[in-house]
């Protein structure tokens, strides 16, 4: 393998335990998905996450153990963006409501909207429970996490041409190596405590040029906001 | 234009291991989904999973226990083994790629299939 | 596992009628149903993705609609070149393809 075991995300680390108290998890039977819980009654995720049926689970970290932290909720409503283009990923951003709040504790609680548009070269934290091998498989029970600087859109595009859009930015190291991967979808990435990307696509993982592709939230928080109030 | 040719042998015998691979010509291995799926003589299409560059696999339950995909993208090919093969699975076995063309989604998700090979008849018999 | 049922199984239409083919899933499966050609000896070719978005190149006297567990794929005028059987297939969980509808010219 190209990097050692214990390289986590795909070059990451265990997040210590409910570290990223805003990070979900989608289940259908399955961890498919993340998600970032946004208020108390509503997730932030990616729109090719989207399924007719999803449970929340919150306040998790190893997701094959029931820890005592855990809070099962299930959608009441799932709301991929009007504009989703499935072939190109444009718009890739979803919101789901919650059926019941969840409860805001030390290990549950809430990530801000941003306030501004990303910034190049701010640190971020990516988390999810996603491949953390980036040729041949392995997914972990326990939350990963990985610190990784936001890219120029010159670089973004470079490394992606004609497939960038406005609506997407590009976070990690053109050297390859650190990467969020298949499973991470829909999780944050959080700068300065903002939420200013959901985990959405790549040209395979922690490849050398192709860092990852994320959906630009700061161009979203007018319909986000203007969605939970018209569905409260 | 990607291009997919399936290779391998046309006649198996039972409970021996169909091993078949995929060429991907024309374009990267690395963006997307890759899928198998069969077709007994004159019957549906049938499902039999998909792998992502990253390794990554999926099977249809009913055959996960024999089934096994790898790739290999330093020769911009993926490869299926099913083993303990019996007559009922005799069929003309397809590669085929997922529709999203622009790099995968980082998802644990499923997708239609826009490329196909054009398919090769596996027999099993004695 | 989804389970998709498709009806009828083989119809006859004279060239310019107005084909229709179900498609219904065993459980919901929100807009993941795509929808294939496959003419004889030849490999399937997608035709509909995501219930109703035609793909690039295919011919727009095909559509689909539906959502949730029942859906439509319609011929608006039948074509001697869309002599070939038809088949539904959801991706919302693994994938799993209907029983086909072999479509001929009367």
């Known amino acids: 393998a190209p990097f050692d075991d214990d390289d986590k995300i795909v070059g990451g680390y265990n997040c210590e335990e409910n570290s990223v108290p805003y990070q979900v998890s989608l289940n259908s039977g399955y961890h498919f998905c993340g998600g970032s819980l946004i208020n108390e009654q509503w997730v932030v995720s990616a729109g090719h996450c989207y399924k007719s049926r999803i449970q929340v689970r919150l306040g998790e970290h190893n997701i094959e153990v029931l820890e005592g932290n855990e809070q099962f909720i299930n959608a009441a409503k799932i709301i991929r963006h009007p504009q989703y283009d499935r072939k190109t990923l444009n718009n890739d951003i979803m919101l789901i409501k919650l059926s019941s709040r969840a409860v805001i504790n030390a290990r549950v609680s809430t990530i801000s909207l941003p306030t501004a548009p990303p910034a190049t070269g701010t640190k971020c934290l990516i988390s999810g429970w996603g491949n953390t091998a980036s040729s041949g498989a392995d997914y972990p029970d326990e939350l990963q996490c990985l610190d990784a600087p936001v890219l120029s859109q010159a670089k973004c595009e470079a490394s992606y041409p004609g497939k960038i859009t406005s609506n997407m930015f590009c976070v990690g190291f053109l050297e390859g190596g650190k990467d969020s991967c298949q499973g991470d979808s829909g999780g944050p990435v959080v700068c300065n405590g903002q939420l200013q990307g959901v985990v959405s696509w790549g040209d395979g993982c922690a490849q050398k040029n192709k860092p990852g592709v994320y959906t630009k939230v700061y161009n979203y928080v007018k319909w986000i906001k203007n969605t939970i109030a018209a569905n409260s | 234009q990607v291009q997919l040719q399936e290779s391998g042998p046309g006649l198996v015998k039972p409970s021996e291991t169909l091993s078949l691979t995929c060429t991907v010509s024309?374009?990267?291995?690395?963006?997307?989904?890759w899928h198998w799926i069969r077709q007994p003589a004159g019957k549906g299409l049938e499902w039999i999973g998909r792998?992502?560059?990253?390794?990554?696999?999926f099977y249809n339950p009913s055959l996960k226990s024999r089934v096994t995909m790898s790739v290999d993208t330093s020769k911009n090919q993926f490869s299926l083994k099913l083993s303990s093969v019996t007559a009922a699975d005799t069929a003309v076995y397809y590669c085929?790629?997922?529709?999203?063309?622009?790099?995968?989604?980082?998802?644990?998700?499923?997708?239609?299939?826009?490329?196909w090979g054009q398919g090769t008849t596996v027999t099993v018999s004695s | 596992d989804i389970q998709m049922t498709q009806s009828p199984s083989s119809l006859s239409a004279s060239v310019g009628d107005r084909v229709t083919i179900t498609c219904q899933a065993s459980?919901?499966?929100?807009?993941?149903l795509n929808w294939y050609q496959q003419k004889p000896g030849k490999a399937p070719k997608l035709l509909i993705y995501?219930?109703?978005n035609l793909e690039t190149g295919v011919p727009s006297r095909f559509s689909g609609s539906g959502s949730g567990t029942d859906f439509t794929f319609t011929i608006s005028s039948l074509q001697p070149e869309d002599i070939a059987t038809y088949y539904c297939?959801?991706?919302?969980?693994?994938?799993?393809f209907g029983g086909g509808t072999k479509v001929e010219i009367k």
């Open positions: 085929a790629r997922d529709i999203t063309n622009y790099g995968s989604g980082k998802s644990i998700r499923f997708y239609p299939m826009d490329v």
């Open positions: 024309g374009g990267s291995i690395s963006s997307n989904y």
């Open positions: 792998i992502h560059t990253s390794g990554s696999t």
């Open positions: 459980q919901d499966i929100s807009n993941y």
């Open positions: 995501d219930a109703s």
């Open positions: 297939q959801q991706d919302d969980t693994f994938i799993t």
